[in-house]
């Protein structure tokens, strides 16, 4: 028998520095977690102790903090090289800055193979990107070799900016022939490493003949066997065992997100490459693991540029940006409108001629808006200003909801109106009218939504049975502020870009902004 140790990360999302337990900015260092310096300590410890070790990343290193905003992927290549990752799969967020923003900082600079079997380049891009990412790679490990085949969410064109010269194929259809090729090379130990979410990971394990292990990402899935060491609630045991259609037991793993854990899976193979056993658990990278001093010093060196960036002007406002709780928790506020407009603008994807855009709606809990911005400071808006407005380090995500769920969400928005509570929704692409004289749960008297399948966008009444795409904060997608109906009833959830980054990009693009209060939220006569 031959034993392989797979160390894995996924959805690190720019958390190069250690973070608080909830993966936001580290405040009390003695209680902070993750970060590449701490990760390196643990990886090196395992590499010294065990003979056959692979360090793999399942995508979405890009996007999530000011590190990505400033360094645009150069930081990912630099620190993944320093940690000596063995391979990485492309995630959807690797395309956030377009194909050029992937090729130059990461694909050309990485000292490890970057993989995806279901992304096919065409047109002029085909020769430019040829060989910079591969469908699969055979890696020597000790005296054996292991095949790693990559995959990426086929929803990427709706979630990021891959352009028109990359085709995202069905994962299973694309993976099978590549695995078959590996078999012709007599490679009999094959890992599928990819970024399509836990449900697809399980399908790959079930359907793709020849895959021995699946290491996934995208859904931020936390798996654990035994008592979990922090706040994350396991979605299943680690590894999660899937019985394949040809009768094999295939371990599937994922390691939550944000570099908080290091996935640790030990696999035992027989001489024919069959998995005999698999066991392990994610390792919580808490403060009991010291940060590696040389990596930490490097982080501190790279950090300097971030501090300078946060005080630079992004754009100007010529109006007061009212982000006060007195406004945003009670009525339409122009800061809410600005943020929602930025959220929609960030999700413009013309992927179908029938649709002017794939999504037109935004909802945003008023309690998530934490500060106004005064225009009387020469109109200047900086990253620092925006960090005061959106201090929680969240993301603006894409969900699919039924109209009936949206109606419930808007009823919840005003179910205890007047108490300055955070659930009051700011909106974009939505016109809502409330009648507060009615009883809670029956206060939404009009709810019109902006069409997407139209050449001239207009507002139509919400249909209860129709499925709508909505951009909203991850906080709401996860049921925050009492929006349990969103969490329970959402049909799809894809994590998006860092909230501050979305707004800062929009302001930089617009240069001068002047958001108004324009009647998106109304109260029927006599009720307010």
């Amino acid at each position: 028998a031959w034993e392989l140790t797979i160390l894995h990360t996924n959805d690190v999302h720019s958390r190069l520095e250690q973070t608080s337990e909830d993966s936001s900015k580290c405040v009390n260092a003695s209680r902070c977690m993750g970060g590449v310096a701490r990760l390196f300590t643990k990886v090196q410890q395992i590499r010294r102790a065990e003979p056959n070790v692979l360090l793999l990343d399942a995508g979405d290193q890009y996007q999530g903090t000011i590190w990505f905003t400033v360094y645009k992927g150069a930081e990912v290549a630099h620190f993944m090289n320093a940690l000596r990752y063995d391979a990485m799969a492309l995630g959807n967020h690797e395309f956030d800055n377009g194909v050029e923003g992937l090729i130059e900082p990461l694909l050309k600079e990485a000292k490890f193979p970057i993989l995806s079997a279901n992304i096919k380049a065409k047109g002029p891009l085909a020769s430019q990107i040829s060989g910079l990412y591969l469908p699969y790679k055979v890696l020597p490990v000790g005296d054996e070799v292991v095949g790693i085949v990559g995959y990426t969410s086929k929803e990427t064109p709706f979630l990021s900016n891959p352009g028109t010269n990359l085709v995202f194929e069905d994962e299973i259809t694309a993976l099978q022939p590549e695995v078959d090729k590996l078999k012709t090379l007599n490679v009999n130990k094959i890992i599928a490493l990819g970024h399509s979410g836990f449900e697809m990971d399980k399908l790959i394990a079930q359907k793709v003949r020849g895959v021995d292990v699946v290491v996934g990402g995208h859904s931020n899935t936390f798996l654990y066997t035994g008592n979990p060491p922090s706040k994350e609630v396991p979605a299943g045991k680690y590894p999660f065992i899937v019985t394949s259609d040809d009768g094999r037991k295939v371990p599937v793993v994922q390691a939550y997100a944000f570099g908080k854990y290091l996935g640790y899976l030990k696999i035992e193979f027989d001489e024919r490459g069959n998995v005999i056993s698999s066991h392990g658990n994610p390792i919580l990278l808490n403060s009991s693991i010291p940060e590696d001093p040389s990596i930490k010093a490097d982080i501190n060196k790279w950090r300097i540029k971030l501090d300078n960036y946060s005080t630079q002007e992004l754009g100007k406002t010529i109006v007061y940006l009212d982000g006060s709780s007195q406004s945003c928790r009670f009525r339409e506020c122009n800061m809410g409108n600005l943020i929602c407009d930025a959220m929609i603008n960030n999700n413009l994807r013309h992927t179908d001629e029938m649709f002017w855009n794939h999504v037109s709606m935004c909802i945003l809990n008023g309690g998530g808006i934490r500060s106004p911005i005064d225009e009387r400071n020469n109109g200047t808006i900086t990253w620092e200003n925006l960090a005061a407005v959106l201090p929680f380090g969240g993301t603006f995500d894409l969900v699919q909801l039924k109209g009936s769920t949206l109606k419930k969400a808007f009823e919840h928005s005003v179910h205890r109106y007047g108490q300055s509570t955070g659930e009051f929704l700011q909106v974009g692409g939505i016109h809502v009218v409330y009648d507060l004289s009615r009883k809670p749960g029956d206060r939404v008297v009009k709810l019109d939504v902006l069409c997407t399948k139209c050449r001239v966008p207009s507002y139509d009444p919400l249909k209860m049975d129709e499925v709508y795409k909505v951009i909203l904060p991850n906080f709401l997608a996860n049921g925050g502020d009492g929006f349990q109906m969103i969490k329970d009833e959402l049909l799809r959830h894809d994590s998006g870009d860092q909230d501050i980054n979305v707004v800062s990009t929009y302001i930089s693009k617009m240069k001068v902004i002047y958001p108004a209060v324009e009647g998106r939220i109304k109260f029927s006569t006599g009720s307010h």
Epitope: N81, R84, D86, E109, A110, K111, F112, P113, S130, G131, L132, L134, P135, Y136, K137, V138, L139, P140, V141, G142, V145, G147, K181, L182, T184, L185, N186, V187
Partner: antibody, heavy 121, light 107 residues
Framework: QVQLQESGPGLVKPSETLSLTCTVS????????WSWIRQPPGKGLEWIGY???????NYNPSLKSRVTISVDTSKNQFSLKLSSVTAADTAVYYC???????????????WGQGTLVTVSS | DIQMTQSPSSVSASVGDRVTITCRAS??????LAWYQQKPGKAPKLLIY???SLQSGVPSRFSGSGSGTDFTLTISSLQPEDFATYYC?????????FGGGTKVEIK
């Protein structure tokens, strides 16, 4: 554009060790397989062995007992040592990288320009 | 080891001719085959990989076909710069092995 350059003595005495270095410029050595291939004068090509950029090796069984390939990532170089040489080891020695599209050292591109090593007393 | 046998060992042809070179593997190698061109005093140059994929920058008059054990390199219209020796190489198993070469000479 990645370029490879072989260097080392052009003349080696029988029974001694042939030592060659390949310097890689214009790209990282770590993510690829790197091979040594030789061609005796007027004859065909013979693959000697590879090293992966992180250090793993694989040698042609016909030469395995005499070959060592090593890598120095800090200098972006890899080296060949062939011990106990005879006149039959006289050849042009090429270093080559696996082609970018190669998943497992399947074909070679680019190549160095080659260096002739003569084994003679 | 997998033996690679090329034929013919040499061929005389004129500019504009269609030239076909064959390569046979002693056992099945799927599509793990490459073709190289070598000119005197120079290193080999990769022309075709994976049996039929044209390497970037190589003229489209070069094409490859075959899978399993029998493979073909075709030059559709021979040009003056194509007079050289051509080698096939299997990339299916170790050790990697080359054919004995086919010399394309001026008629």
């Amino acid at each position: 554009q990645v370029q490879l350059q072989e260097s080392g003595p052009g003349l080696v005495k029988p029974s001694e060790t042939l030592s060659l270095t390949c310097t890689v410029s214009g790209g990282s050595i770590e993510r690829y397989y790197w091979s040594w291939i030789r061609q005796p004068p007027g004859k065909g090509l013979e693959w000697i062995g590879y090293i992966y950029g992180r250090g793993s090796t694989n040698y042609n069984p016909s030469l395995k007992s005499r070959v060592t390939i090593s890598v120095d990532t800090s200098k972006n170089q890899f080296s060949l040592k062939l011990s106990s040489v005879t006149a039959a080891d006289t050849a042009v020695y090429y270093c080559a990288r696996e082609s970018q599209e190669s998943p497992y050292n399947n074909w070679f591109d680019p190549w160095g320009q080659g260096t002739l090593v003569t084994v003679s007393s | 080891d997998i033996q690679m046998t090329q034929s013919p060992s040499s061929v005389s042809a004129s500019v504009g001719d269609r030239v076909t070179i064959t390569c046979r593997a002693s056992q099945g190698i799927s599509s793990w085959l490459a073709w190289y061109q070598q000119k005197p005093g120079k290193a080999p140059k990769l022309l075709i990989y994976a049996a039929s994929s044209l390497q970037s920058g190589v003229p489209s008059r070069f094409s490859g076909s075959g899978s399993g054990t029998d493979f073909t390199l075709t030059i559709s219209s021979l040009q003056p710069e194509d007079f050289a020796t051509y080698y096939c190489q299997q990339g299916n198993s170790f050790p990697r092995t080359f054919g004995g070469g086919t010399k394309v000479e001026i008629k």
